[in-house]
């Protein structure tokens, strides 16, 4: 009874299309598949960034797979052929592994790369990234930012740098069409007459770094003798109302401070008959239904009301 064997895939390689971390893993079918003409072979692919403890595992019938990686580190991948049990009248047969690695040869020492990279997507409209120059780099060092996301034909360079003393320390991005809910890749590299500069790679999703504008039009009405209704409006811009969460800070008579989080643009507050004055501020953030993370807006302007005045208004009405 001859043992059934299958070869590993051929020409397994990791291809870098220049998308700053989005790579292609591709291969050719194994040699001598003629015996299994009526059989659909599958491939088990495992890959990871070097240093990561866990492998990502994919089983596919295709001859490629695409995914994002951290190019600050190397990438390793391995693949083998699987012959399903239907093809072998018994148990699944696996080939030996074919392996591939990829890394970008680093230039310069790590300290030369940009420090404290910070990107904020203001009001889900304007992306701004800023950084500090590497440690010990001279003023002749300049940094350049490139970015890519699925939908762009190629990586683009920043066209509107923020400069200090002629040195690029940030980038104002143009309008980024259809760029949210997908990985956004950035590379900041550098050049200097004196020494090589290390490149840095960053990946994030834009909806997770949104800093909205603060809420506006804060109002206050007395619903009943001991109930005050606080209201505000969503900030202007593209963020829909369903995507906001709010934090309110309420001060009664400069003593009691209440901080609470709400999901709508209203909050009803119980007060005592001792309450004289009421002040509140609100800030907004993108909620968990629209993003995995976010940045709180600045606080709104503080609004204060005399409770007595509110009561008079209520009685008049």
């Amino acid at each position: 009874d001859t043992e059934i064997k299958v070869n590993p895939p051929q020409d397994f390689e990791i291809v870098d299309p220049g998308y700053l971390g989005y790579l292609y893993l591709q291969w050719q079918p194994p040699l001598s598949l003629d015996n299994f003409k009526e059989c659909t072979v599958e491939y088990e692919l495992k890959y990871r960034n070097i240093g990561s403890e866990t492998w990502t595992t994919i089983i596919t019938k295709n001859l490629h797979y695409k995914d994002g990686f951290d190019l600050n580190k190397g990438i390793e991948a391995k693949i083998h052929t699987l012959l399903p049990w239907q093809c072998t009248n018994g148990s699944e047969v696996q080939s030996s592994w074919a392996e591939a690695t990829y890394w970008i040869s680093p230039q310069g020492i790590p300290e030369t790369k940009v420090q404290d990279m910070d990107c904020v997507y203001y009001n889900w409209q304007y992306l701004l990234c800023s950084w500090k120059p590497g440690i010990g780099v001279l003023l002749d060092t300049n940094y350049n930012l490139f970015y890519w996301y699925e939908g762009l034909d190629r990586a683009l360079q920043c066209v509107d740098y923020i400069k200090v003393d002629g040195q690029n320390i940030g980038c104002r991005f143009p309008y980024l069409e259809s760029s949210d809910y997908k990985d956004f890749y950035i590379c900041v590299n550098g050049s200097s007459e004196t020494k090589p500069i290390r490149s840095s790679y960053f990946t994030f999703q834009l909806q997770n770094i949104v800093k909205p504008l603060p809420p506006v039009c804060l109002t206050c009405t007395q619903e009943s003798l001991y109930e005050i209704k606080l209201k505000w409006s969503i900030p202007l811009g593209p963020i829909p109302a369903r995507c906001f969460v709010y934090e309110i800070e309420i001060r009664e008579d400069d003593t009691t401070l209440v901080t609470t989080t709400v999901e709508n643009e209203t909050y009803t507050l119980k007060i005592t008959n001792e309450t004289r004055q009421l002040c509140f501020v609100v800030r907004s953030k993108v909620n968990i239904y629209c993003s995995d993370d976010g940045i709180w807006s600045e606080w709104s302007d503080k609004q204060c009301w005399e409770v007595e005045e509110l009561l008079k208004k209520t009685l008049l009405l």
Epitope: V15, P17, G18, Y19, Y24, Q26, Q28, P29, T60, K61, N62, L63, H64, K66
Partner: nanobody, 121 residues
Framework: QVQLQESGGGLVQPGGSLRLSCEVS????????MAWYRQVPEKEREMVAQ???????KYYGSAKGRFTISRDSAKNAVYLQMNSLKPEDTAVYRC???????????????WGQGTQVTVPS
């Protein structure tokens, strides 16, 4: 199914040029990768150049700087312009495509018969 027809091979003196063509015909829904390989008897096949996903072009080994791969999507064709040819470029050059058949659901690999390129020493 799918046929790949190569042409353009032949005998050329060292330093000369050749342009290989490969036309794809048959019931193919999408062509995702196009490549040229070469094989010398008793040796493993070797990738020369490829146009892969996202029209990314990659050259291998001594092909870098001397060979140029291009494609004509309208004609379903791939070309290999070979300049400054050397005796060590002598091989059978085979065209390969990776794509999905009109009746298929996943990628398959298709090969041409090959065209002989000879550069005498």
């Amino acid at each position: 199914q799918v046929q790949l027809q190569e042409s353009g091979g032949g005998l050329v003196q060292p330093g000369g040029s050749l342009r290989l063509s490969c036309e794809v015909s048959g019931s193919i829904f999408s062509i995702n990768r196009m490549a040229w390989y070469r094989q010398v008897p008793e040796k493993e096949r070797e990738m020369v150049a490829q146009i892969t996903y996202g029209d990314t072009i990659k050259y291998y080994g001594s092909a870098k700087g001397r060979f140029t791969i291009s494609r004509d999507s309208a004609k379903n064709a791939v070309y290999l312009q070979m300049n400054s040819l050397k005796p060590e470029d002598t091989a059978v050059y085979r065209c390969n495509i990776v794509g999905v058949l009109t009746t298929g659901h996943y990628e398959d690999s298709f090969w041409g018969q090959g065209t002989q390129v000879t550069v005498p020493s």
